[in-house]
């Protein structure tokens, strides 16, 4: 088939890099500068993608493969292929409409992107509190508060009666 | 493919005047926030000025508050900066962009701006 196809197509002897040029009866040309072709065959060639501004280059393009852009400091990519840059903000904070905004009470964010999340409930697992959380860290859980008594162990005696709300000494 | 393409950069005196134009494809223009921000020689990038798509919502950084003006004609898919009583500071390199102060994309070689006498 390929034969076939190349007989009846004289572009599909056209490498990556080249493009089938019809002014020049149907020869393979090199891409021009600052243009590429990825694929065999191509009639024409892509203008290659420029990291300006907002983006700064991580690849250079060269005659078979686009440019790669990445975001100057203080910002990081979005979407596929780095589409957009976005705004970094502090640990601690997230990004609003508004700007950066510090995480609220019992929030987080260990990271210069994305959003403050809650931070972890101990008490759900059945655990407690080892370090207190803060903007920037979640909370550290540790045993649950039973298995912290003094003298604990697989076999726990009754705890002797305390008045509701006092803590154990 | 997206493409936005700044123009209208130069020379001028301290205290002078320009008018920074951009032109924009491959998007629904009248669709999106645009910005215009500015490199100067080995610095970070700078915001200067966010417009809202229907042109309603103008906010300015500190430093071009009462000297630059940014407006949009959805029309002509265009984007403009009047840049009066231009300061030496001012010099840069200006970049037009899809989006907000806090979220953008942009794809023109920019326009250069230089100030001095």
């Known amino acids: 088939f390929e034969r076939t196809r190349s007989l009846q197509d004289p572009c599909s002897n056209c490498p990556a890099g080249t493009f089938c040029d019809n002014n020049r009866n149907q020869i393979c040309s090199p891409c021009p500068p600052n243009s590429f072709s990825s694929a065999g065959g191509q009639r024409t060639c892509d203008i290659c993608r420029q990291c300006k501004g907002v983006f700064r280059t991580r690849k250079e393009c060269s005659s078979t493969s686009n440019a790669e852009c990445d975001c100057t400091p203080g910002f990081h990519c979005l979407g596929a292929g780095c589409s957009m840059c976005e705004q970094d903000c502090k640990q601690g904070q997230e990004l609003t409409k508004k700007g950066c905004k510090d995480c609220c009470f019992g929030t987080f964010n260990d990271q210069k992107r994305g959003i403050c999340r809650p931070w972890t409930n101990c008490s759900l697992d059945g655990k407690s509190v080892l370090v207190n959380g803060t903007k920037e860290r979640d909370v550290v859980c540790g045993p649950s508060p039973a298995d912290l008594s003094p003298g604990a162990s697989s076999v726990t005696p009754p705890a002797p009666a305390r008045e509701p709300g006092h803590s154990p000494q | 493919q997206v493409q936005l393409q700044e123009s209208g950069g130069g020379l001028v005196q301290p205290g002078g005047s320009l008018r920074l134009s951009c032109a924009a494809s491959?998007?629904?223009?009248?669709?999106?926030?645009m910005t215009w921000v500015r490199q100067a020689p080995g610095k970070g990038l700078e915001w200067v000025s966010s417009i809202s798509s229907g042109g309603s919502r103008i906010i300015y950084a500190d430093s071009v508050k009462g000297r630059f003006t940014i407006s949009r004609d959805n029309a002509k898919n265009t984007l403009y900066l009047q840049m009066n009583n231009l300061r030496p500071e001012d010099t840069a390199v200006y970049f037009c962009a899809r989006g907000t102060r806090y979220k953008m994309s942009t794809s023109g070689p920019g326009t250069q701006v230089t100030v001095s006498s």
């Open positions: 491959g998007f629904t223009f009248s669709d999106h926030t």
